[in-house]
């Protein structure tokens, strides 16, 4: 111990320094550094000592601020107090706080203590400073946010004299029908299927599924993953800490979905899946999981029910032929809601209608997904809409297009079922959100989900 024996004379107190073998002395009045051996000289009987005071030189370490204090501190020193910067404590700010002691990393994140700071290493499906943002939502292959043009492949299998074509854009998780998956051509020796996300995104997992072709189960037993930012230069996903391509386990039957997560996650615009071993033909339905690069793009609870019925209100309600059992209430405006009455429909078709969600607390809203529905077989949807937001539910601000400085009109749906996602950038930070239908087909009809996060850093 550098302070044992005490190198400070005249009753000075020894403080170990941050560097090995270093120390400093806190000296009583009348003595000065470095070892409290120098006596402060007095100029004459009439004058005060020429000491610069207890804050000179600064006794506070690690950027602490020394403040002169008239009162006793009650422990060791008179005359000053050290105000410590974040990450340090102690009388002289000499101790580096271990921020990991309070377990700031959520969701299984691993905390590393740094000097006046900490970092969290998050599992693949979480992100953010404290791993507080979930990042494992479907990116839209199944729901249709990812369009047909965004899904391409090395080849397409053609059957029944070329009449049946198992196109790449059929590779949507849980797709139904006679032709309901992508199948690579028989002569394709190195098949792949590719998703263009249209912007760099954080991809944290993939779900795969096989299908039945001519009554026979077909599926991919194992596969590799590659990614790219330009669609030309590709990197294979590796086993962590090695240069070995990761081979992911695939399916064991034609219908059960199987999920794999990417830890660390992929950050890319393009993702390619390379089948390695297939049962019969390489046949695939799939979904990618992840979020926007910024995180904070998880469903806020319309679909899951986390947003409760009473939180969803509307300007008016439609009843099919005024039948109570065919009431298209706002609480039914939940993405992918099923049933004969499975959406909100307004009682009037005009631009004064709205669907409102009360998020209960101010929330960062970074995106929205909309969907139409059918009433008695008729396709109905909102083709475009505006957004408004409020913190008191009374005074509303319509979301503006930053460049044009006018109300932003978001592109809506073009059918009754496909998900249409719009990114809200810059995000809205508010408690109440209103969707304001601007154009529609049939009657104003909506199912929706809000994307964002409730925890702000």
């Amino acid at each position: 111990d550098i302070c044992d024996p005490n190198p400070c004379e005249n009753g000075g107190i020894c403080l170990p320094g941050l560097a090995d073998g270093s120390f400093s002395c806190e000296c009583p009045d009348g003595f000065t550094d470095p070892n409290c051996s120098s006596v402060v000289e007095v100029a004459s009987d009439e004058e005060e000592p020429t000491s610069a005071g207890p804050c000179t030189p600064n006794p506070c370490h690690n950027g602490g601020t020394c403040e002169i204090s008239e009162a006793y501190r009650g422990d060791t020193f008179i005359g000053y107090v050290c105000k410590c910067p974040r990450g340090f404590n102690g009388i002289h700010c000499q101790h580096n706080i271990n921020e990991c002691e309070v377990e700031p990393c959520k969701n299984g994140g691993i905390c590393t203590d740094l000097v006046a700071n900490y970092s969290c290493e998050c599992p693949g499906e979480f992100m953010g400073r404290n791993c507080q943002y979930k990042c494992s939502g479907p990116l839209g292959i199944e729901g249709g946010i990812i369009s047909n043009q965004q899904i391409t492949a090395s080849s397409t299998h053609r059957a029944l004299f070329g009449l049946q074509k198992w196109y790449p854009y059929y590779a949507r998780l849980n797709k139904k029908g006679l032709i309901n998956a992508w199948t690579a051509a028989e002569n394709d020796r190195w098949p792949w299927i590719q998703i263009n996300l249209q912007r760099k995104m954080r991809v944290t997992g993939v779900i795969t599924q096989g299908a039945k072709r001519i009554g026979s189960p077909e599926y991919i037993k194992s596969y590799k993953i590659a990614y790219s930012n330009d669609g030309k230069t590709w990197a294979m996903y590796k086993v962590k800490g090695t240069n070995e391509d990761m081979v992911f386990r695939g399916n064991i039957d034609n219908n059960t979905p199987y999920a794999n997560s990417f830890t660390p996650p992929i950050k890319a615009q393009y993702v390619r899946l390379y089948p390695q071993v297939c049962r019969r033909h390489c046949t695939l339905r799939m979904e990618l999981l992840g979020c926007e690069l910024s995180g904070c793009s998880e469903p806020l609870g319309m679909k899951s029910g986390h947003i409760q019925d009473y939180q969803i209100t509307a300007s008016s309600i439609f009843r099919t032929l005024n039948m109570d059992m065919f009431t298209w209430e706002p609480r039914k405006a939940r993405l992918d809601k099923q049933g004969k009455v499975n959406a909100w429909t307004s009682g009037h078709n005009d631009q004064s209608q709205w669907l409102q969600v009360d998020l209960l607390v101010p929330t960062k809203v970074t995106g929205i997904i909309t969907q139409g529905a059918k009433d008695f077989g008729h396709v109905q949807f909102v083709g475009s809409y505006k957004l408004a937001y409020s913190n008191d539910g009374e005074h509303w601000t319509v979301y503006q297009d930053e460049k044009q400085r006018k109300d932003k009109v978001f592109q809506g749906n073009f059918d009754n079922d496909t998900h249409r996602k719009n990114v809200i950038d810059p995000p809205i930070y508010a408690r109440h959100i209103r969707i304001l239908p601007w154009s529609w087909y049939g009657r104003i009809t909506l199912r929706s989900e809000l994307l964002g996060c409730t925890e702000e850093e």
Partner: antibody, heavy 125, light 107 residues
Framework: EVQLLESGGGLGQPGGSLRLSCAAS????????MNWVRQAPGKGLEWVSA????????YSTDSVKGRFTISRDNSKNTLYLQMNSLRAEDTAVYYC??????????????????WGQGTLVTVSS | EIVMTLSPATLSVSPGERATLSCRAS??????LAWYQQKPGQAPRLLIY???TRATGIPARFSGSGSGTEFTLTISSLQSEDFAVYYC?????????FGGGTKVEIK
């Protein structure tokens, strides 16, 4: 030419069955909900039953529920009304009628912009 | 169910004259009302929907008005081809219901 043509009417026994057909032409049959409307001799019109374009939803008036079944075969552009447990009060001219539906705007409602000529059903012993 | 009452049951009018038919609903049906014309041995023909909007191909002499429970069909100048039976139909509530009919005959 856009038209509807009913058939299958005639004499039915009380408690018996009849099946009416309505052949559609000149429009995309599967895009439209279809209806049966009847008119008793010397009386007004009475709506009987409706079916959605895909055939997955139906509505019927209370007086025929459990006895009459509306159905359609879009591959044949044909609407049907299966009439079971016939009663004397079912005697009427039966019309098939196409719903109003504007495919451009998607607007639709429960009134009828195209009717067939009707087929007479007489229920008598 | 909503009862639709058409009056008068018979209306005798000379060609070129105005004919006014009334339809009353037993409760409010907003503007969800249609008018049809039926000639003997023929199928009904849609004239008016939404209480006041003329169907495709319907001459301007036919006009509709009203909302709630009281509705009117007006034929401004009767032509020979307009002599027929007229029906109103509400499509606000289930079941769909028609009025009993008004016969417009030559005076």
């Amino acid at each position: 030419e856009v038209q509807l043509l009913e058939s299958g009417g005639g004499l039915g026994q009380p408690g018996g069955s009849l099946r009416l057909s309505c052949a559609a032409s000149g429009f995309t049959f599967s895009s439209y909900a279809m209806n049966w409307v009847r008119q008793a001799p010397g009386k007004g019109l009475e709506w009987v039953s409706a079916i959605s374009g895909s055939g997955d939803s139906t509505y019927s008036t209370d007086s025929v529920k459990g006895r009459f079944t509306i159905s359609r075969d879009n591959s044949k552009n044909t609407l049907y009304l299966q009439m079971n447990s016939l009663r004397a009060e079912d005697t009427a001219v039966y019309y098939c009628a196409k719903e109003y539906y504007d495919i451009l705007t998607g607007y639709w409602d429960w009134y009828f912009d195209l009717w067939g000529q009707g087929t007479l059903v007489t229920v008598s012993s | 169910e909503i009862v639709m009452t058409l009056s008068p049951a018979t209306l005798s009018v000379s060609p070129g004259e105005r004919a006014t038919l009334s339809c009353r609903a037993s409760q409010s049906i907003n503007s969800n009302l249609a008018w049809y014309q039926q000639k003997p041995g023929q199928a009904p023909r849609l004239l008016i929907y939404g209480a006041s909007t003329r169907a495709t191909g319907i001459p301007a002499r036919f006009s509709g008005s009203g909302s709630g429970t009281e509705f009117t069909l007006t034929i401004s100048s009767l032509q020979s081809e307009d002599f027929a039976v007229y029906y109103c139909q509400q499509y606000n509530n289930w079941p769909l219901t028609f009025g009993g009919g008004t016969k417009v005959e030559i005076k």
